[in-house]
Interface confidence: low
């Protein structure tokens, strides 16, 4: 239905399909009574060559034969692989203004004969599937190439299917649509692939196989697991398989794991007992099948079964710590803290904690349950107290963890020596110490405890701590460590019934403070000036403040100011200076210094001492 070739015809010799490297002759002929005018000599036939719809050459100089005004023959050579379009046009030489008129055209295909197909592989998916074979076609032919797949077998069984390759589709697989049944398990089958195009044909070598060689079982389905007596560690995996399956492979792993547990099961008949599962853990299970112990192929893995194993009672020891605060003469507040069990110890969802405080001699016992990881009680200051905590889930409780309540910093002889805190990187601090010099009882363990030095941190936030064995003298603290924040770090040495502690401040990264302290008042007492200030707001400190500096100079002086450097103490907010002249007006200001440098100055205050100077 394309309106072309009204004016004439185009033919190609030897054929419109030629091998690579061959030449072809293209003849263009005008139909009777077609042309430019009544003078045939004014008809000029030209041949244009197009590749991918783009004009690449005018073959005017390739004429090998010419019947003036009626037909011309052109020789074309060096054609590239694939399709090339040639269009014959009529050029009327006595009418230069008119463009050439299309006459007709032809496509010449350049290609190669097919290579023998290789690497034939056949599969039948499942006992009820059909046989499908694939192969390697070899080099691209650039021509439409037909492939025929033939299968022959016992009892005169023959079957064949066809497909073709061209520039839009590739034929390297065919489904024969026939089913091989298990009763032919020992029979041999032969397949062969034949390729044919306009330039030649070729055949593969015969490929021989048996039923067991090619049948891939369907993956197991309907996978489920039963846990014996709601056990969290033992379960029976069950599934459905095709009837002929004799071997299964099972793989399973916790969902966050990167390596599978693998199990081979012979004649499992859709059931296998697993005994080493982790309680209260999300698992993924998959199964593969095989029809023969030695030969044949494994099926694809089944779809995953994802399920969580049941809970079992918690195991492991809770990590407990505490704080003591005297309330008045005969009462103290005990705050107990503990860390959550890790999942492998909790073995379920922890529902609550059982907390016990017991006075050893009088046998007074306070008991409670809580869902939190801390508990506070007021108890008498007298007596020896011990605390215990256990964690409970739906299946039971862990063994209680005990700790003796001692005066944590009560014994100077147990205080660790030479405590230092060095920033290691942005989010951890290395704490080191030396053991107590004259401990009168053995150190059972060290506790390194830290909290941010910010207002209300003692009441608002629980402490962070690490338990360190008695032969270690260092700890890398990282939990909840943020840069530009100062932490109070305590190292406790604990014996069976006593405690000693040393304290230091440290930060993981520091900058110079954003601002200096704000001078609130200057007062004169007994020939000394007392400078009072408010501390720098916590976010503006940007690390641990090492010291404050008080500067002063005479009001209109251009001389360098004098300064006094004060060791930083959180509890201190005033300091005396005594080197100012009476009845001279001074300007005073303060700065703060961290390990990274000095802050800008705080507010300036003027003051004129009245008293007698020292």
């Amino acid at each position: 239905n394309i309106d072309v070739c009204k004016l004439g015809t185009v033919t190609v010799q030897p054929a419109p399909v030629i091998p690579l490297g061959s030449a072809a002759n293209i003849s263009c002929s005008l139909n009777p009574k077609q042309g430019c005018s009544h003078y045939p000599s004014s008809n000029e036939l030209i041949l244009l060559k197009f590749v991918n719809d783009v004009l690449v050459e005018n073959l005017h100089g390739k004429k090998v034969h010419d019947h003036t005004g009626h037909s011309s023959t052109f020789q074309v050579t060096n054609l590239s692989l694939g399709m090339t379009l040639f269009v014959c046009k009529l050029n009327c030489s006595n009418s230069q203004k008119k463009p050439p008129v299309p006459v007709c055209g032809v496509e010449i295909s350049v290609g190669v004969a097919p290579e023998p197909p290789q690497n034939i592989s056949c599969v039948q998916e499942g006992e009820n599937g059909t046989v499908a074979c694939s192969w390697n076609s070899g080099k691209v032919t650039y021509l439409k190439t037909n492939y025929t797949l033939q299968l022959s077998g016992p009892n005169n069984l023959t079957c064949q299917k066809q497909c073709f390759s061209d520039n839009r589709q590739n034929c390297n697989r065919l489904d024969l649509g026939i089913n091989l049944s298990p009763d032919l398990a020992e029979s041999r089958f032969i397949v062969r692939v034949t390729a044919i195009n306009d330039l030649g044909n070729s055949s593969s070598l015969p490929h021989t196989f048996t039923f067991l060689d090619i049948v891939i079982p369907l993956p197991p389905w309907d996978i489920r697991i039963n846990f014996l007596n709601a056990s969290g560690s033992r379960g029976t995996l069950q599934w459905e398989d095709e009837g002929q399956v004799v071997l299964n492979q099972l793989r399973y792993q916790p969902l966050n794991s990167t390596s599978w547990n693998m199990v081979n099961a012979t004649n499992a008949k859709g059931k296998y007992d697993l005994r080493d599962l982790r309680p209260f853990t999300e698992y993924e299970f998959q199964i593969s099948s095989k029809l023969h112990l030695s030969g044949g192929s494994w099926s694809n893995w089944s779809e995953s079964l994802r399920t969580r194993t049941p809970e079992e009672e918690p195991v492991g020891i809770l990590d407990i710590w505490y704080m003591k605060q005297d309330i008045d003469y005969d009462r103290q507040q005990i705050s107990l803290f503990w860390k959550s069990l890790n999942p492998s110890e909790a073995r379920g969802k922890i529902l609550h904690y059982q907390v016990t405080l017991q006075e050893v001699t009088k046998k007074t016992t306070l008991q409670n349950t809580t869902r939190h990881t801390s508990w506070t009680r007021v108890i008498p200051r007298t007596g020896a107290w011990t605390a215990s905590v256990s964690a409970a889930n739906s299946k039971g409780a862990s063994a209680p963890t005990h700790i003796n309540i001692v005066d944590l910093c009560g014994t100077g002889l147990l205080a660790p020596h030479q405590v230092s805190a060095k920033s290691e990187n942005m989010d951890n601090i290395l704490v080191t110490w030396q053991p107590p010099k004259k401990a009168d009882s053995a150190v059972r363990e060290y506790i390194v405890e830290w909290r941010a030095l910010q207002p209300g941190s003692i009441t608002k936030f629980p402490p962070h701590w690490l338990r360190i064995p008695p032969d270690n003298m260092s700890a890398l603290i990282s939990e909840n460590i943020k840069p530009y924040i100062c932490y109070e770090i305590r190292v406790h040495a604990l014996s069976e019934s006593q405690g000693g502690c040393s304290s230091i401040r440290g930060d993981s990264k520091h900058k110079a403070p954003v601002s200096g302290p704000h001078i609130t008042a200057i007062t004169e007492k007994k020939e000394r000036l007392f400078i009072s200030w408010t501390h720098i707001p916590f976010p503006e400190q940007r690390g641990c403040i090492l010291h404050y500096r008080i500067y002063w100079k005479e009001r209109d002086s251009t001389a360098q100011p004098e300064l006094c450097e004060i060791q930083y103490r959180r509890s201190q907010n005033s300091h005396p200076i005594s080197s100012l002249q009476p009845r001279v007006t001074y300007v005073l200001w303060m700065t703060a210094v961290t390990a990274a440098g000095e802050s800008p100055q705080g507010n300036e205050r003027e003051f004129c001492p009245q008293g007698k100077a020292n």
């Epitope: 394309i2 070739c5 783009v54 379009l85 269009v87 839009r168």
Partner: nanobody
């Protein structure tokens, strides 16, 4: 290189309408030298001819779409269109634009546009 680009596909309720467009671009003399056609291919099925329009204007339709679909062309815009009315769920497929040019046959195909008809 000549290219065909379809557009206008989408999700539509049964009984609804869509208009597909196919624009030709590249080193092309003119779309009026081409016989144009729309094909469609549903998952797992053979590609089938839906409608065609020759370079002289003769038109043909598959039996399954006669009376519901209309093919047209605009040579000035180098485009061909398929107006689809009274769509049915069985019309769900990837619709491909095809252009045939030259002698004796030179095929161009677009990438396709998805049409989904929900019931």
């Amino acid at each position: 290189q000549v290219q065909l680009q379809e557009s206008g596909g989408g999700l539509v309720q049964a009984g609804g309408s869509l208009r597909l467009s196919c624009a030709a671009s590249g080193s092309i003399r003119s779309i009026n030298a081409m016989a144009m056609a729309w094909y469609r291919q549903a998952p797992g099925k053979q590609r089938e001819l839906v409608a065609s329009i020759s370079n002289s204007g003769s038109i043909g339709y598959a039996d399954s779409v006669k009376g519901r679909f209309t093919i047209s062309r605009d040579n000035g815009k180098n485009s061909v269109y398929l107006q689809m009315n009274s769509l049915k769920p069985e019309d769900t497929a990837v619709y491909l634009c095809n252009g045939r040019t030259g002698w004796p046959r030179y095929d161009l195909w677009g990438q396709g546009t998805q049409v989904t008809v929900s019931s």
